[in-house]
């Protein structure tokens, strides 16, 4: 999640440091994630927490006993797209139903909020220059948000804003391979607010994922799963109302 990069690096080789759809104003670059005491505790929601972290309750998002990855995913084929009209993301010039899903539901069904947890299929895997955009609103008194870029049972990139971890707000990123969470990377810059709308953009780069929130760069996460084409699903979960999830190439 190191942030040692320049605008030139942001889209190396593209000749365009500010590609369409990616934030032009990068905001204050957050400090590198660093080690953070206790950061070695594996995992964002492997169903358990460090001792004392969540006294008397399961950690947010533990989903005890849940079958599969994202119980309650919407019925197959139901993929309403991003809102239309002013303020819809991404900006004009990109596909109107960016990424995957038409602006109305399938076969003329009206678009509406997406059911969370939600799976966004990525049929061709991920590839450099793919921009994934997620729009929603954080619920009041939220505990957590999670994005999981999945490769089968593995989680290639877990992006997990936690609103109250030991009375702190922190973003935890990690990878799960063969059911084992790796080394956490933590970010103390926290751009989410309970009850407020958000836009998360994830730009896939050859060596890392780049994340921006509300048009300001937030963090980078180096690829630990190298076969990007195997990352073929994005799971979205947590305490949010989800408006749209889509992707485009930039």
């Amino acid at each position: 999640m190191a942030d040692n990069f320049s605008l030139h690096d942001a889209l190396s080789g593209s000749g365009n440091p500010n590609p369409q759809g990616w934030p032009g104003a990068w905001g204050n670059q957050p400090a590198g994630a660093g080690g953070y005491p206790g950061a070695s505790y594996p995992g964002a929601y492997p169903g358990q927490a460090p001792p004392g972290a969540y006294p008397g309750q399961a950690p947010p998002g533990a989903y005890p006993g849940a079958p599969g990855a994202y119980p309650g995913a919407p019925a197959p084929g139901v993929y309403p797209g991003p809102p239309s009209g002013p303020g819809a993301y991404p900006s004009s010039g990109q596909p109107s139903a960016t990424g995957a899903y038409p602006a109305t539901g399938p076969y003329g069904a009206p678009a509406g909020p997406l059911i969370v947890p939600y799976n966004l299929p990525l049929p061709g895997g991920v590839v450099p220059r793919m921009l994934i955009t997620i729009l929603g609103t954080v619920k009041p008194n939220a505990n957590r948000i999670a994005l999981d870029f999945q490769r089968g049972n593995d989680v290639a990139f877990h992006f997990n804003p936690r609103f109250n971890e030991n009375n702190r707000r922190v973003i935890v990123c990690n990878t799960k391979l063969d059911n084992n969470w790796g080394r956490e990377e933590r970010q103390s810059v926290f751009p989410f607010e309970s009850g407020k709308p958000f836009k998360i953009q994830v730009l896939v780069e050859p060596d890392h994922f780049k994340v921006a929130v509300n048009d300001a760069h937030l963090l980078q996460y180096n690829h630990r799963v190298k076969k990007l084409n195997e990352i073929s699903k994005l799971g979205i979960s947590g305490d949010i109302d989800l408006t749209s999830a889509s992707y485009t190439m930039i």
């Epitope: 995913a73 960016t98 299929p121 049929p123 089968g152 073929s232």
Partner: antibody, heavy 115, light 107 residues
Framework: QVQLQQPGAELVGPGSSVKLSCKAS????????IHWVKQRPLQGLEWIGN????????HYNQKFKDKATLTVDKSSSTAYMQLSSLTSEDSAVYYC????????WGQGTTLTVSS | DIVMTQSHKFMSTSVGDRVSITCKAS??????VAWYQQKPGQSPKLLIY???TRHTGVPDRFTGSGSGTDYTLTISSVQAEDLALYYC?????????FGAGTKLELK
């Protein structure tokens, strides 16, 4: 090397059901979606649906949602497609293929529905 | 559903010719397009994905290009073994959809 093995042919009667198989080898089965594609003689390719072997999440072409049921058996790295209420319109070659762009295909099963 | 239109059902060519097969999507598919070659009695074979990425082992006379709604498969110098059916496909969203195919034949 990556292989998707399908039986060569199935002959069934109208109104019956059939379960076609696709056995994967040479890669981690749960890391790639399996897709099923229909091809009628002298006609094009038609996507039926796909399944994620890791958690059995499925997506169907609306046209086939009452016709096809996709399942997997992770222990044998095999994907299945059951076709029900068969008619002559279901006579076709059925391919399984890997991923969203199909880098590997099975050889196809020729299904004949005939009395 | 996204409709993929291959306007030419047949294209006549000679060995050594340069030929371009086109495909038009009914909406922007953001370069999520693949091309396949199919010969009689065989499964389709992947040539190109993400519009321009050549699959492993595909000869470099095959190139893919395009963006938005318009995509092209070009064979720079047609060989006898290239005479086949060619399909485009969008892998942008489900339902995944194919073009009707273009048959490349000898003049």
């Amino acid at each position: 090397q990556v292989q998707l093995q399908q039986p060569g042919a199935e002959l069934v009667g109208p109104g019956s059901s059939v379960k076609l198989s696709c056995k994967a080898s040479g890669y981690t089965f749960t890391n790639y979606w399996i897709h099923w594609v229909k091809q009628r003689p002298l006609q094009g390719l038609e996507w039926i649906g796909n399944i994620d072997p890791s958690d059995s999440e499925t997506h169907y072409n609306q046209k086939f949602k009452d016709k096809a049921t996709l399942t997997v058996d992770k222990s044998s790295s095999t994907a299945y497609m059951q076709l029900s209420s068969l008619t002559s319109e279901d006579s076709a070659v059925y391919y399984c293929a890997r991923h969203g762009y199909y880098d590997y295909w099975g050889q196809g099963t020729t299904l004949t529905v005939s009395s | 559903d996204i409709v993929m239109t291959q306007s030419h059902k047949f294209m006549s060519t000679s060995v050594g010719d340069r030929v371009s097969i086109t495909c038009k999507a009914s909406q922007d598919v953001s370069t999520a397009v693949a091309w396949y070659q199919q010969k009689p009695g065989q499964s389709p074979k992947l040539l190109i994905y993400w519009a321009s990425t050549r699959h492993t082992g595909v000869p470099d006379r095959f190139t893919g290009s395009g963006s938005g709604t318009d995509y092209t498969l070009t064979i720079s110098s047609v060989q006898a073994e290239d005479l086949a059916l060619y399909y485009c496909q969008q892998h942008y969203t489900t339902p995944l959809t194919f073009g009707a195919g273009t048959k490349l034949e000898l003049k």
